[in-house]
Interface confidence: medium
């Protein structure tokens, strides 16, 4: 978080600097500004025609404006006092990504159980304090997403937390005390997701030195795929500022950013059902694991139960999944029906079962990869068949695939982003089914969205249990 570039000059100039200055102080400020903009705003210095510090064209000015706009300064396009002060301020070394909050390329973890390992410990703090700060930092993000983090002590973790000094093998050398404090890499294999903290800093549990918890919250944001926010209240704002860690909260922008990647916590995650007892049907927080039509009925799956609703009738009944299909597991995660074939497909983890005429087919479960999913897809969140197109839509995290049931193969050009092609529907869908010839009903937590696929927009927002006359 609190990154400083190596300062070419400690002093800052006063007033606005035109870009044709010739004094050594102003030259140094321009050189410093260049390097700052190169590092954080993608200025390509080799494309700047320079003659005695004179810049032709507007490339440098445009980058200064971009930086001023992003960091909330008055936009002047000049290296004025406030701009130079901001350039010298403690900040994160990850480049500033513009109005979209994700990292460039938008990588995300394609699973919700993520491991981390603390590779080594700073001598500045007790080991227990380091463990606690890192655990609490991960908890900040798990509180607002479906993500679950677990610490492992040996083996390959998704996110490696490292304390290192100077050059440490990633081509992003630390620069001693007071310079770059930490950096992190977006989700991916190998170094992807890893968070590095400069050992030359003095790490603390309080406001002195550099607070490890606050820095880790920011860096873990990067590890999860977030870029920088232009909201000064956000933990993902580029510059570091100590806040009371006892009252620390993510800003609305941080939450919006992370939930745009992973969705919000599922209701049954926030409100666990430890004894797996029958959920209350009219609980306003009720969510479902999977929903599908079966003939003229709608099946709502939750834990080891399902509710059966006959279309257009208020009466519903609850049953154990095992009472109808003893060979099927609890916790069905996705389901869809091809009514013309009297087939229902049920999914859990990386397996699926085929039900024909309400009877499980032999030789199942089979792997979901037989549909043509890539290996990184480990589970399906939701699925729905559209008989008009004879296509099945599979929703996985923030993406969806489209499967041609006639040709028994995935359509080309997928996956696509849910948010791009289902206007108003966020990522991470719990369940979906198709009804009344033109509506998809999307379930997210305790909310349900009636989506007209012809108009391509949400036409109604309902509670998930609205089908039961609650």
């Amino acid at each position: 978080m609190k990154f400083l570039l190596i300062l070419l000059l400690q002093a800052t100039a006063s007033g606005a600097l035109p870009l044709n200055s010739s004094t050594s102080l102003e030259k140094n400020n321009v050189l410093f500004g260049e390097r700052y903009l190169e590092k954080f705003y993608g200025l390509e210095i080799n494309k700047l025609p320079v003659t005695k510090m004179k810049y032709s064209g507007n490339l440098m000015k445009e980058k200064i404006q971009e930086m001023q706009h992003f960091l909330g300064l008055k936009v002047t396009g000049q290296l004025d006092t406030s701009t130079l002060e901001m350039m010298h301020a403690p900040r994160c070394g990850v480049p500033d990504v513009h109005h979209f909050r994700e990292m460039p390329g938008g990588p995300v973890w394609r699973k919700h159980y993520i491991t981390y390992r603390i590779n080594n410990y700073t001598p500045d703090m007790n080991r227990e304090d380091v463990d606690y700060a890192i655990r609490k930092a991960f908890q900040v993000w798990s509180n607002v997403t479906p993500l679950k983090f677990s610490k492992i002590n040996t083996g390959m973790a998704d996110i490696l937390v490292v304390f290192a000094r100077g050059a440490h093998g990633d081509f992003h050398a630390f620069d001693g005390k007071g310079g770059i404090l930490a950096h992190a890499f977006g989700p991916g294999s190998g170094i992807g997701g890893d968070a590095h903290f400069d050992e030359d800093e003095f790490w603390t549990t309080h406001s002195g030195g550099t607070n490890l918890f606050l820095t880790a919250v920011h860096e873990i944001g990067h590890s999860l795929g977030l870029g920088h926010s232009s909201d000064p209240k956000a933990v993902m704002f580029p510059t570091y500022k100590y806040v009371d860690i006892n009252t620390f909260r993510l800003s609305a922008d941080d939450i919006r950013g992370i939930q745009s990647l992973y969705g919000d916590p599922k209701e049954n995650q926030r409100l666990p059902n430890p004894d797996n007892s029958e959920p209350a049907l009219c609980d306003p927080n009720l969510s479902f694991d999977a929903v599908t039509t079966v003939g003229n009925k709608i099946f709502f799956f939750k834990d080891r139960f399902f509710w059966l609703k006959v279309s257009e009738r208020p009466k519903t009944s609850v049953n154990l999944i095992s009472s109808l299909w003893p060979t099927l597991p609890s916790g069905i995660e996705a389901a869809y029906e091809i009514e013309a074939r009297n087939q229902v497909f049920l999914f859990k983890d990386d397996k699926y079962w085929l039900i024909s005429n309400l009877r499980p087919e032999p030789n199942y479960p089979k792997s979901i990869h037989s549909f043509g999913f890539p290996n990184f897809v480990k589970k399906i969140d939701a699925a729905v068949f559209n008989p008009r197109f004879y296509r099945t839509y599979f929703f996985v995290d923030n993406q969806y695939w489209r499967y041609d049931e006639r040709r028994q193969m995935m359509d080309p050009g997928y996956p696509k982003l849910i948010t791009k092609n289902f206007q108003g529907i966020g990522p991470k869908i719990d369940a979906v089914f198709y009804s009344k010839n033109k509506y998809y009903y999307f379930f997210q937590g305790s909310n349900q969205f009636e989506y007209d696929f012809l108009l391509q927009r949400i036409t109604k927002t309902l509670k998930s249990n609205s089908w039961f006359g609650c």
Partner: antibody, heavy 124, light 108 residues
Framework: EVQLLESGGGLVQPGGSLRLSCAAS????????MTWVRQAPGKGLEWVSY????????VYADSVKGRFTISRDNSKNTLYLQMNSLRAEDTAVYYC?????????????????WGQGTTVTVSS | DIQMTQSPATLSLSPGERATLSCRAS??????LAWYQQKPGQAPRLLIY???NRATGIPARFSGSGSGTDFTLTISSLEPEDFAVYYC??????????FGGGTKVEIK
């Protein structure tokens, strides 16, 4: 269809207050910077206020600073302008507008979606 | 603050004629300039951004040019629906975002 619809205008006495709303539809409201622009009768356009996508950053014209507050509720796809201590010179049609940004730079390049406007009259 | 001055205040032309509208900034705004069209009783519409780029759906008869302090909006051949008020606006130095006073293009 991308749409902005203002409401809340009306006649108010000097020193009074009004709250304007701008309902957005047809686009992902929470991704975009928004702004209010006003136009006094028979006059030109005057920029009033700006708000960032999450609402965390707000900017005002000097003429309204300290009296007007811009805010947004992304869950309701709505932009607001709370106007206090109104003066006769605040009489105008108030437009909300979506600020488009360059895909590369992220800088605002123009206001390319506008509402139809709502009229505010400050008079005793 | 940067002042934007438009000229002429009124331009009287016939359909089919070429219209040339001018906008001058009190200091350089690079190419950070937009043009808007406003018809009576309607909201403004973005025509040109960054001095010379046409906004989505704007006909090719509209073009913008200039950089620094002097800018021009040209309508190559006026159509009946082009008679309106045109505003320029800078974003080079803000807040505030400033508009010009407008040029009214009226039927001769």
């Amino acid at each position: 269809e991308v749409q902005l619809l203002e409401s809340g205008g009306g006649l108010v006495q000097p020193g009074g207050s009004l709250r304007l709303s701008c309902a957005a539809s047809g686009f992902t409201f929470s991704w975009y910077e928004m702004t209010w622009v006003r136009q006094a009768p028979g006059k030109g356009l005057e920029w009033v206020s700006y708000i960032g996508p999450s609402g965390g950053r707000t900017v005002y014209a000097d003429s309204v600073k300290g009296r007007f507050t811009i805010s947004r509720d992304n869950s309701k796809n709505t932009l607001y302008l709370q106007m206090n201590s109104l003066r006769a010179e605040d009489t105008a049609v108030y437009y909300c507008a979506l600020v488009s940004q360059g895909e590369i730079s992220g800088l605002p390049y123009g206001m390319d979606v506008w509402g139809q406007g709502t009229t505010v009259t400050v008079s005793s | 603050d940067i002042q934007m001055t438009q000229s002429p205040a009124t331009l009287s032309l016939s359909p089919g004629e070429r219209a040339t509208l001018s906008c001058r900034a009190s200091q350089s705004v690079s190419s950070n300039l937009a043009w808007y069209q406003q018809k009576p009783g309607q909201a403004p519409r973005l025509l040109i951004y960054d001095a010379s780029n046409r906004a989505t759906g704007i006909p090719a008869r509209f073009s913008g040019s200039g950089s620094g302090t002097d800018f021009t909006l040209t309508i190559s051949s006026l159509e009946p629906e082009d008679f309106a008020v045109y505003y320029c606006q800078q974003r080079s130095n803000w807040p505030p975002l400033t508009f010009g006073g407008g040029t009214k293009v009226e039927i001769k």
